[in-house]
């Protein structure tokens, strides 16, 4: 029950996190015009990964996409890449984790298979979260570096525009959304990995047991237990001689496909 709860919670937390990463990536407010200790302007500038926007006092907002690819700073391209990789990995992780959920039965999928899928999705969520955190942190570092360098006529800005007005940019809402979302995805991934341990059938060390039946002295050697990878067939122990006795693995109860936790 605890394993199912951990897995379910990990899935939900990761789902929220990935939704947040997608939201952050799409948001325009990665950097916003610094209003502190600056003249009050009737124009407010803010920039995202894909476009820059200007909001006037009138409420009129104009956004312009970065239609150039080569003209953009390498750091911005790197941040874009990290966020997209994070989204892709997260999306695949979500897809895998849906099938891995213990509360959902697909055919006669073994718990060992679910355990492996849970681990896979967990690792994907962890990497996804790290990508988002890294992307946001790189952008934040870029802002801090540029903050004091924003002087008149300096060639800066995400769109590579000539600045004739000293416009300094500070952290936008998207950065905080990205950090939180990345953290949630990371936590969700860790929870999935923890749940995986509880799902995996533990490997049993079998010892040879001597059985005596009908006066015959026959030794029984149980076959080695092969743990399922989740993708191959689960090779069960084969009896050497069926003399009414059961090997240890045969008396273990396996959950049927109708057992729901």
């Amino acid at each position: 029950m605890a394993v199912t709860a951990c897995q379910g919670l990990g899935f939900v937390v990761s789902l929220i996190g990935i939704a947040g990463i997608i939201a952050a990536t799409c948001m325009d407010q990665w950097s916003t015009q610094d209003l502190y200790n600056n003249p009050v302007t009737a124009v407010f500038n803010y920039q995202g990964l894909w476009r820059s926007c200007v909001r006037e006092s009138s409420g009129f907002t104009e956004c312009r996409g970065y239609f150039t690819l080569l003209g953009l700073p390498a750091m911005l391209q790197a941040v874009r890449a990290l966020m997209i990789v994070g989204i892709v990995l997260g999306a695949i992780g979500l897809l895998v984790s849906i099938f891995a959920l213990k509360c959902i039965r697909i055919g006669s999928m073994e718990d060992s298979a679910k355990a492996n899928m849970t681990l896979t999705s967990g690792i994907m969520f962890i990497v996804s979260g790290l990508c988002a955190i890294a992307g946001v942190s790189v952008f934040a570092n870029m802002l801090v570096t540029n903050f004091w360098m924003s002087t008149a006529n300096m060639y800066t800005g995400m769109g590579g525009m000539v600045q004739t007005v000293q416009t300094r940019y500070t952290f936008g809402a998207a950065l905080f959304v990205g950090w939180v979302a990345g953290g949630l995805t990371l936590i969700g991934g860790v929870m999935m990995c923890i749940a995986c341990r509880g799902l995996a059938p533990e490997e049993t060390n079998y010892k040879a047991v001597s059985y005596h039946a009908s006066g015959h002295s026959v030794a029984y050697k149980p076959g080695g237990f092969k743990a399922s990878t989740g993708f191959g067939s689960n090779t069960k122990n084969k009896k050497i001689y069926d003399g009414g006795a059961r090997t240890e693995d045969e008396v273990q109860s396996y959950p049927s496909k109708h057992d729901y936790v």
């Epitope: 015009q33 003249p39 009050v40 302007t41 009737a42 124009v43 500038n45 920039q47 820059s52 926007c53 200007v54 006037e56 006092s57 009138s58 409420g59 009129f60 104009e62 312009r64 008149a152 800005g157 525009m161 000539v162 600045q163 004739t164 007005v165 416009t167």
Partner: antibody
């Protein structure tokens, strides 16, 4: 047709108070920022105050800050300017103007004359 | 505060001739975000409220004759009336629409010579 009509002007003694009103019609008043601009007799234009569409931002000229208060009632399609501690130099025709993209004033009222004199 | 300096104070031009009014701001009115200059030109005739002519330094307001044009960037701007008509006799004001307070220039009176 967009119309802005100012009222409330008149003769007032120095130190006195006056409340100007601007009635708006012909457009969705609640969607536009509004300004007050004044013009002393025979002089140029002087910006006085601004209020955003949802009252979230309010700005004043240094010359009136602390004495004048801008407000609006979107339900009544009205803009107001409460003027306290009036001085002789506040004598002017007061215009209300609608803010539009480019932060320009596309429509102006006909103005109301405020005379501060003893 | 941003100081807007207009020149000349008054201008007498013959009908059909070109009239040029200059406006200089103490700080750049160019916004880096959209590369637009936040400067507006108004025309005021006697006894009337001002009328919007040009915004974003060079964009003509709808209904304004094409003989009116605006140019310039940063701190230096110009309003040009390519062929002065009798109805153009008025006072012209430039306005800073970038920094609060939104200051106006002193005005330029255009008359017919």
């Amino acid at each position: 047709e967009v119309q802005l009509v100012e009222s409330g002007g008149g003769l007032v003694q120095p130190g006195g108070s006056l409340r100007l009103s601007c009635a708006a019609s012909g457009f969705t008043f609640s969607s536009f920022g509004m300004h007050w601009v004044r013009q002393a007799p025979g002089k140029g234009l002087e910006w006085v105050s601004y209020i955003s569409s949802g009252n979230s931002a309010i700005y004043y000229a240094d010359t009136v800050n602390g004495r004048f208060t801008i407000s609006r009632d979107n339900a009544k399609n009205s803009l107001y300017l409460q003027m306290n501690s009036l001085r002789a130099e506040d004598t002017a025709v007061y215009y209300c103007a609608r803010l539009r993209y480019g932060n320009s004033f596309d429509y102006w009222g006909q103005g109301t004359l405020v005379t501060v004199s003893s | 505060d941003i100081v807007m300096t207009q020149s000349p104070d008054s201008l007498a031009v013959s009908l059909g001739e070109r009239a040029t009014i200059n406006c200089k701001s103490s700080q750049s009115l160019l916004n880096s975000g959209n590369q637009k200059n936040y400067l507006t030109w108004y025309q005021q005739k006697p006894g009337q409220p001002p009328k919007l002519l040009i915004y974003w330094a060079s964009t003509r307001e709808s209904g304004v004759p094409d003989r009116f044009s605006g140019s310039g960037s940063g701190t230096d701007f110009t309003l040009t009336i390519s062929s002065l008509q009798a109805e153009d006799v008025a006072v012209y004001y430039c306005q800073n629409n970038y920094y609060y307070p939104l200051t106006f220039g002193g005005g330029t009176k255009v008359e017919i010579k």
